[in-house]
């Protein structure tokens, strides 16, 4: 009988045993146990990864596969030798014994062995293919790595070169900036010197202009005087001719001509034929007391007596009651004509008041009151106004009914405070009210949010301080 059995030896190798009669044939075959299972990431017929494996792992795997192949090759060679040896022995026995059925058994064994060999060969072929596939992939990966490395090296070199270029450029620019700074400092210094020179020049020119203005004023006054003298001489000649006839009429004529020379206001000056704007001497009504006033002979037909002007902040308007009474400043510039003169004048006949305003943005506006007068000092020069027209607000910025005049030393306002002290300047304050054209003079860009500035509420609001103002009066019947 024959019996075919498969088992394991002590080291776990597969044994193929054939029992035939008293003869027992044992074959120890090599196995690929050193190859990893299909769960291992290294099995080549498993699903291939997208990302390449680590280079060191790939090399290690190649070494493992090579050792397995060598192992298998050695086993195959041993097996072949073993088969050849056994076949020889068997052939001798068959020939010696000439037993027919032994031949059949040997053929069966041979067939089995051939099948096993074929199976082993197929497995080895598979392993070889896997190794080849893995080797090819590793070569490709190595090539990719090499290319990538070369590319990176090139990029690094390019960047290094670029950095060097930029550093050179930066150094150049830094040098340029430093040079420019030096030039700039020199330029600034020269500009500063120029500015100082210009300032000196401007102040000189200002002095010259002021001197010329004084000369012009003097010339104007002289011109007026000359005109008067000419007029007087003509009249004197005429008087002398008349005097020859009658001495009594001559006296009357002289007195009349003397009266004609005095001017009560700028309307009188204008009517006399003096139509050039400038400073003229005016005489108080019913008095010989005189005051100098600026006459505006151009605005709206001329004949305007200027009673206030602000234009540059050159005159301090925080003055006493007495100063506001008699007047202060320069009639050709910033000034207050004087409350006493204006009160006396406006109580003689009906006058209109025109207030001309200018802001810092180049805008102009005016308020015209068709009836204006001041009470006497006894009533604190209280202001009286009627009939407002004009562009500086539909509502009067001088409180109605009119208020008494207040100064820093005469508090006649309606406030618990002293408006003149709070807002500065003398004015017809209420409590303290919507206007104060005698407030602090603020220059451009400092003229907003100034509650003690030159204020005309119904044109520019609470905190706006104006650039220039003029107050002028003229008889209503002019």
């Amino acid at each position: 009988y024959s019996n075919f059995r498969k088992s394991m030896d002590s080291v776990g190798r597969k044994q193929y045993q054939v029992q035939h009669g008293s003869c027992s044939y044992t074959f120890l075959l090599p196995e690929t146990d050193n190859c990893r299972s299909s769960s291992s990431p290294y099995v080549s017929n498993a699903v291939q990864r997208d990302a390449p494996l680590d280079y060191d792992d790939s090399v290690h795997r190649l070494q493992v596969l090579e050792s397995i192949m060598e192992n298998n090759t050695q086993w195959l060679m041993k097996l072949e030798n073993y088969i050849q040896d056994n076949m020889k022995k068997e052939m001798v026995e068959i020939q010696q014994n000439a037993v027919q059925n032994q031949t059949a058994v040997m053929i069966e064994i041979g067939t089995n062995l051939l099948n096993q060999t074929a199976e082993q060969t197929r497995k080895l072929t598979d392993v070889e293919a896997q190794v080849l596939n893995q080797t090819t992939r590793l070569e490709l990966q190595l090539l990719e790595h090499s290319l990538s490395t070369n590319k990176l090296e090139k990029q690094i070199l390019d960047q290094t070169s670029e950095i060097n270029k930029l550093q050179d450029k930066n150094s150049f620019l830094e040098k340029k900036v430093l040079d420019m700074e030096d030039k700039h400092i020199v330029q600034l210094q020269s500009i500063k010197e120029e500015k100082d020179q210009l300032q000196v020049l401007v102040s000189k020119q200002n002095s010259i202009i002021e001197e010329l203005e004084r000369q012009l004023v003097t010339a104007t006054v002289n011109n007026s005087a000359l005109q008067k003298q000419q007029h007087d001489l003509t009249e004197t000649v005429h008087s002398l001719l008349t005097m020859i006839a009658t001495s009594s009429s001559a006296k009357n004529s002289f007195a009349a001509k003397e009266e004609q020379i005095t001017f009560r206001d700028c309307a009188d000056v204008f009517r006399s034929g003096l139509t050039t704007s400038g400073i003229y001497t005016l005489t108080f009504p019913n008095s010989t007391e005189e005051t100098k006033a600026y006459c505006d002979m151009e605005t709206g037909g001329g004949g305007w007596t200027t009673i206030q002007r602000r234009e540059d902040g050159s005159v301090d308007f925080q003055r006493t009651w007495k100063e506001y009474k008699v007047g202060f400043g320069n009639p050709s510039g910033e000034h207050w004509l004087g409350n006493e003169f204006v009160s006396q004048l406006t109580n003689q006949q009906r006058y209109v008041l025109k207030i001309h305003l200018r802001d810092w943005e180049g805008n102009e506006a005016y308020s015209l009151y068709e009836h204006f007068y001041l009470s006497s000092e006894e009533f604190n020069y209280r202001i009286h106004l009627k009939g407002l027209t004009g562009t500086a607000g539909k509502i009067s910025s001088i409180s109605q009914p009119g208020n008494d005049f207040s100064t820093k030393d005469a508090d006649n306002d309606k406030c618990i405070c002293k408006c003149s002290q709070m807002l500065t300047g003398g004015w017809w304050f209420d409590a303290c009210g919507p206007s104060n054209l005698n407030g602090m003079y603020y220059p451009q860009r400092q003229n907003t949010n100034k509650f003690n500035g030159i204020k005309w509420y119904y044109w520019k609001g609470s905190g706006y301080s104006l650039k220039a103002t003029t107050m002028m009066i003229r008889p209503a019947d002019f």
Epitope: C415, I416, C417, K418, Q421, M422, A431, C432, G433, P434, N449, K450, F451, K455, Y457, K460, G461, S462, G463, Y464
Partner: antibody
Framework: QVQLVQSGAEVKKPGSSVKVSCKAS????????MVWVRQAPGQCLEWMGY????????GYNQKFEGRVTITADESTSTAYMELSSLRSEDTAVYYC??????????????WGQGTLVTVSS | DIVMTQSPDSLAVSLGERATINCKAS??????VAWYQQKPGQPPKLLIY???TRDTGVPDRFSGSGSGTDFTLTISSLQAEDVAVYYC?????????FGCGTKVEIK
């Protein structure tokens, strides 16, 4: 009676803007200036600016210049204060208040109830 | 800006006793000073203006004085309802500024 009613509390992110309203009643809205004052936690009262509702004239504390805008709507008797580019230190109670005088920004006789503005990221 | 410095920061006074709060301006503000009372969770309330004038409805136990740079608010007889923070405020010069407050408590 004279009353100023302000809008409700606001929580804002840094860099954003807030607009607080103040509705006046019981008096002629255009007869008095309106001011805005703020009070940060543990800080002094700070005057921010004013508006004259009669002519829309405004004035601002230089500290807030460029960030604060005060407006008024005569038709609804409402004043508004908008503060932009908010920072955490703008967290405060914001008050509107009426000045006693139209012509001058002096003392403040009527105050709103206040609006808490919290600036937090 | 004009700085208004209040003193003391806090003040504890017995009921019926006098409480005095001082305020010093960094420059002359004439009499353009107001005083406000602020109770917790409420807006400030005007008490005094023009340094010494009581606003309508303010009890006469509150009085103000001073001019120039030194100002005082006096509560002649402290009442429980007077517990609050008191602020001085100058409006003489732009921008108007406030003191940082004096807390009045009952001892």
């Amino acid at each position: 009676q004279v009353q100023l009613v302000q809008s409700g509390a606001e929580v804002k992110k840094p860099g954003s803007s807030v607009k607080v309203s103040c509705k006046a009643s019981g008096y002629s809205f255009t007869d008095y200036n309106m001011v805005w004052v703020r009070q940060a936690p543990g800080q002094c009262l700070e005057w921010m600016g004013y508006i004259d509702p009669y002519n829309g004239g405004t004035g601002y504390n230089q500290k807030f210049e460029g960030r604060v805008t005060i407006t008024a709507d005569e038709s609804t008797s409402t004043a508004y204060m908008e503060l932009s580019s908010l920072r955490s230190e703008d967290t405060a109670v914001y008050y509107c208040a009426r000045t006693r005088d139209r012509y001058d920004v002096w003392y403040f006789d009527v105050w709103g109830q206040g609006t808490l503005v919290t600036v937090s990221s | 800006d004009i700085v208004m410095t209040q003193s003391p920061d806090s003040l504890a006074v017995s009921l019926g006793e006098r409480a005095t709060i001082n305020c010093k301006a960094s420059q002359d503000v004439y009499i353009a000073v107001a005083w406000y009372q602020q109770k917790p969770g409420q807006p400030p309330k005007l008490l005094i203006y023009w340094a010494s004038t009581r606003d309508t409805g303010v009890p006469d136990r509150f009085s103000g004085s001073g001019s120039g740079t030194d100002f005082t608010l006096t509560i002649s007889s402290l009442q429980a309802e007077d517990v609050a923070v008191y602020y001085c405020h100058q409006y003489s010069s732009y921008p108007p500024t406030f003191g940082c407050g004096t807390k009045v408590e009952i001892k």
